[in-house]
């Protein structure tokens, strides 16, 4: 057993058929040592009497919120969550696997830049009595600080008769330095509870290898004199970090006709511009990517060839 | 060339409903995800709804979650966007958004698009 924050405790339970559970000793936080007596959540059943409590937790029965009371006034809670382990594995059925991008991926996130901001979110079923808290640091042995907000709920994805809920958390590290080369990854741990079952998800991961850029911005297109060219030309996005002479990024140029099915021209490029041919009824895109690390393209910028 | 162009937006009192309609042009519409933004005066571009490209799955934000439904028609080429129990918060332009492909984003890319239109004014007030 161990204490989640004041008055939580998470016991943590091997679960199978007739399992021995736990002993848990319950104290009882008063001053007070006669004339205790203890409850379970709203039931007035006493459950023994005494300034501690010993009880044998097997089942999510016997979780909850244990309640010491003296002569009708409340004197203190315990709340009891269970944490499930299953054939030596931690049971994972709150979140969803996202399967992105691989099996048991449960938290995924994304940063826009080098600033040591970053975004993760996840997916549930549930709809009620779910709670979240999102703790973070750079390393764990001797962790440095990363501060996070409260998870919130960013979006419901309804696909068909199932519902999921989409929710998300802003970090920011204390101390990021964007230059610098990543020698401790960031752990990102996610406290669970729905309703009486505790649950716990990490994901780790180096801000580089989450790196995904906005779109360029500001793409236009001039027409070069007696020629079917045109010159593209774009700006990096004001979300990358600067200066670009260091954070540099490279960048994709598409040409692609109407149906996705006709053939695209690409050209790769570090300039901020391209010379193209720009087809009937097409459009031009253009996409970005660190220059020097091969982490997420962004998503494409597009106009059209008008 | 690809058009979005937005319609259905006007001044409802609080509590009452508009739906929002988007006809899309210029591209193949039952090939992508589209989505609805929408800037309220003094504040940044916020991700309202989005919607995959056959319909079989939608997105709706938090903040408008059981009050607004996305849906489309790709045999008419058009978006819209039901706003029901409309709140003074919920005065802004709303667009309506091409995504870059058939599904819907990540939560970090939903307020980045391909194509935007030039927006409806949405005003809630007594």
């Known amino acids: 057993i161990w204490e989640l924050k004041k008055d939580v405790y998470v016991v943590e339970l091997d679960w199978y058929p007739d399992a021995p559970g736990e002993m848990v000793v319950l104290t009882c936080d008063t001053p007070e040592e006669d004339g205790i007596t203890w409850t379970l959540d709203q039931s007035s059943e006493v459950l023994g009497s005494g300034k501690t409590l010993t009880i044998q937790v097997k089942e999510f029965g016997d979780a909850g919120q244990y309640t010491c009371h003296k002569g009708g006034e409340v004197l203190s809670h315990s709340l009891l969550l269970l944490h499930k382990k299953e054939d030596g594995i931690w049971s994972t059925d709150i979140l969803k696997d996202q399967k992105e991008p691989k099996n048991k991926t449960f938290l995924r996130c994304e940063a826009k830049n080098y600033s040591g901001r970053f975004t993760c979110w996840w997916l549930t079923t549930i709809s009620t009595d779910l709670t979240f808290s999102v703790k973070s640091s750079r390393g764990s042995s001797d962790p440095q600080g990363v501060t996070c907000g409260a998870a919130t709920l960013s979006a419901e994805r309804v696909r068909g008769d199932n519902k999921e809920y989409e929710y998300s958390v802003e970090c920011q590290e204390d101390s990021a330095c964007p230059a610098a080369e990543e020698s401790l990854p960031i752990e990102v741990m996610v406290d669970a509870v729905h309703k009486l079952k505790y649950e716990n998800y990490t994901s780790s991961f180096f801000i580089r290898d989450i790196i995904k850029p906005d779109p360029p911005k500001n793409l236009q297109l001039k027409p070069l004199k007696n020629s079917r060219q045109v010159e593209v030309s774009w700006e990096y996005p004001d979300t990358w970090s600067t200066p670009h002479s260091y954070f540099s990024l490279t960048f994709c140029v598409q040409v692609q006709g109407k149906s996705k099915r006709e053939k695209k021209d690409r050209v790769f490029t570090d300039k901020t511009s391209a010379t193209v041919i720009c087809r009937k009824n097409a459009s031009i895109s253009v996409r970005a990517q660190d220059r020097y690390y091969s982490s997420s393209w962004s998503e494409w910028a597009s106009v059209p060839c008008s | 060339e690809v058009q979005l162009v937005e319609s259905g937006g006007g001044l409802v009192p609080p509590g009452g409903s508009l739906r929002l309609s988007c006809a899309a042009s210029?591209?193949?519409?039952?090939?992508?995800?589209m989505s609805w933004v929408r800037r309220a005066p003094g504040r940044g571009l916020e991700w309202i709804s989005s919607i995959s490209s056959g319909s079989d799955t939608t997105h709706v934000a938090g903040s408008v979650r059981g009050r607004f439904t996305i849906s489309r028609d790709n045999a008419k080429n058009t978006l819209y966007l039901q706003m029901n129990s409309l709140k003074p918060d919920d005065t802004a332009v709303y667009y309506c958004v091409r995504a870059y492909d058939s599904i819907v984003p990540s939560p970090t890319q939903r307020t980045n698009y391909e194509y935007r239109g030039q927006g409806t004014q949405v005003t809630v007030s007594s």
């Open positions: 210029g591209f193949t519409f039952s090939s992508y995800a």
